[in-house]
């Protein structure tokens, strides 16, 4: 796979993953009422990071936001923070990667700069994906813990004994947002890894197609094959160099190197 394709695919995969992270963060169905072996409620409860909702049997849905910060569980706050950090890093990663894309030419930006930006965006995407995966996993763990606690104590009170009143323990299970979050985090992570792999192909490397200097009779100048191809953007950076002893030889060019992918 060429650098351009690897980089482009990494960018697209990360973009899809990032969109999924945003979607998961905004979704209301992080936890949904467990309907198995439960009292059959005429309302269906589900909860998100920002609000809790109820769908009545008529289909009418009503949501209430969590209008407090201090009253919320620390774990929920942590999950919110992780998802927001993931989104912020993803936004930065996308902005950086747009400029890093090999297929987009911006001014006289050389490959080493693009390589650095590609690596930066890749790392940002990896961290973004990890944040999302951790956030979703923390929430899932919280759900599992609460699920078994409420299963062990299905009804609080003694239900009529000693005048105590039964209260319905609504158990919650994994909502769609968790699966969206896991997949999205994974895609962002994979996309980031692909960007990092693409970066290696962009980085100037001694082993990659060294420039070959030809001794032109009467002129001690070296020409690099393909050095003036407009599509690669190397033209403006190609400099003539003196040849100190005759014959064809290779030399390192500090400005930019054609890579093995440039002629694909």
């Amino acid at each position: 796979m060429s650098v351009t394709a690897c980089q482009g695919l990494g960018f697209v995969v990360s973009l899809i993953g990032f969109a999924g992270i945003i979607a998961a963060t905004c979704m209301d169905q992080w936890s949904t009422q467990d309907l198995y072996n439960n009292p059959v409620t005429a309302v269906f409860n589900y909860q998100g990071l920002w609000r809790s909702c109820v769908r009545e049997s008529s289909g009418f849905t009503e949501c209430r936001g969590y209008f407090t910060l201090l009253g919320l569980p620390a774990m929920l706050q942590a999950v919110r923070a992780l998802m927001i950090v993931g989104i912020v890093l993803g936004v930065i990663g996308i902005l950086v990667s747009i400029f890093a894309l090999k297929c987009i030419r911006i001014g006289s930006m050389d490959d080493s700069a693009k390589a650095k930006m590609t690596l930066t965006s890749g790392i940002l995407f990896i961290i973004s994906g990890i944040c999302a995966i951790i956030g979703v996993s923390v929430f899932a763990n919280m759900l599992v813990t609460n699920f078994w606690m409420s299963t062990a104590n299905m009804y609080s009170g003694m239900g009529g004994m000693g005048g105590m009143v039964q209260t319905v323990q609504t158990r919650y299970t994994f909502g769609a947002a968790l699966f969206v979050g896991w997949v999205a985090g994974g895609l962002t992570l994979i996309g980031g890894v692909m960007m990092c792999i693409a970066c290696r192909g962009l980085t100037p490397d001694d082993s990659n197609f060294k420039a070959v200097s030809y001794h032109a009779s009467g002129q001690n100048v070296a020409y690099r094959p393909g050095g003036f191809k407009a599509s690669t953007g190397f033209g403006s950076n190609t400099r003539n160099k003196k040849i100190y002893d005759g014959g064809a030889r290779t030399e390192d060019d500090e400005q930019s190197h054609p890579t093995k992918y440039d002629y694909v």
Partner: antibody, heavy 119, light 113 residues
Framework: EVQLVESGGGLVQPGGSLRLSCAVS????????MHWVRQAPGKGLEWVAY????????YYADSVKGRFTVSRDNAKNSLYLQMNSLRAEDTAVYYC????????????WGQGTLVTVSS | DIVMTQSPDSLAVSLGERVTMNCKSS????????????LTWYQQKPGQPPKLLIY???TRESGVPDRFSGSGSGTDFTLTISSVQAEDVAVYYC?????????FGQGTKLEIK
């Protein structure tokens, strides 16, 4: 105007069967869940059954479970209650009721049809 | 099943008087998801089918006079008629609309002295 008209009531022997119908008009029948509620003579109200708009959710009172079957035909704007293995305690006025959009309320009631189970 | 218990069974009041009737459920009817109580009140006048008065424990159905009001949360609910009129003579039922089966209270009969 919302209208719910029950029919099919009458006298039936214990162990017998009866099918109640409810003809609906004045609203989009296919968008609303429907209930059957009964009231024994001189007694209070007893919820019998519920069927959701798309028939995906059907619930029954314990006292009629396994004997009564609720169904609907959205094309005909009709609700049905098939009653089998009838008992004397099933004697009541049966109301066809629309499930309200808000609060799971029972917002529109028919006039009812009397079912008498007696030998 | 949720048991709904209404009190008193009957009451006789004078016209214009304020009246309250209670309804107690054996389980909480409060939904944390939308902070609402799933209790409904109905009025049944003699020879007529019941009529919806109040849903969500305190929201009046459209067309219901504002002298009717509902309150309460969790397991204890109250229906109040601020100034009883002659046409309010009826049996009032509360209903659990939170958990199936949707049980009714036994009713409170309101009469005029």
């Amino acid at each position: 105007e919302v209208q719910l008209v029950e029919s099919g009531g009458g006298l039936v022997q214990p162990g017998g069967s009866l099918r109640l119908s409810c003809a609906v008009s004045g609203f989009t029948f296919s968008s609303f869940g429907m209930h059957w509620v009964r009231q024994a003579p001189g007694k209070g109200l007893e919820w019998v059954a519920y069927i959701s708009s798309g028939t995906t959710n059907i619930y029954y009172a314990d006292s009629v479970k396994g004997r009564f079957t609720v169904s609907r035909d959205n094309a005909k704007n009709s609700l049905y209650l098939q009653m089998n293995s009838l008992r004397a305690e099933d004697t009541a006025v049966y109301y066809c009721v629309r499930s309200g959009y808000y609060g799971n309320s029972l917002d529109y009631w028919g006039q009812g049809t009397l079912v008498t189970v007696s030998s | 099943d949720i048991v709904m218990t209404q009190s008193p069974d009957s009451l006789a009041v004078s016209l214009g008087e304020r009246v309250t009737m209670n309804c107690k459920s054996s389980q909480s009817l409060f939904s944390s998801g939308n902070q609402r109580n799933y209790l409904t009140w109905y009025q049944q006048k003699p020879g007529q089918p019941p009529k919806l008065l109040i849903y969500w424990a305190s929201t009046r159905e459209s067309g219901v006079p504002d002298r009717f009001s509902g309150s309460g949360s969790g397991t204890d609910f109250t229906l109040t008629i601020s100034s009883v009129q002659a046409e309010d003579v009826a049996v009032y039922y509360c209903q659990n609309v939170y958990i199936y089966p949707l049980t009714f209270g036994q009713g409170t009969k309101l009469e005029i002295k």
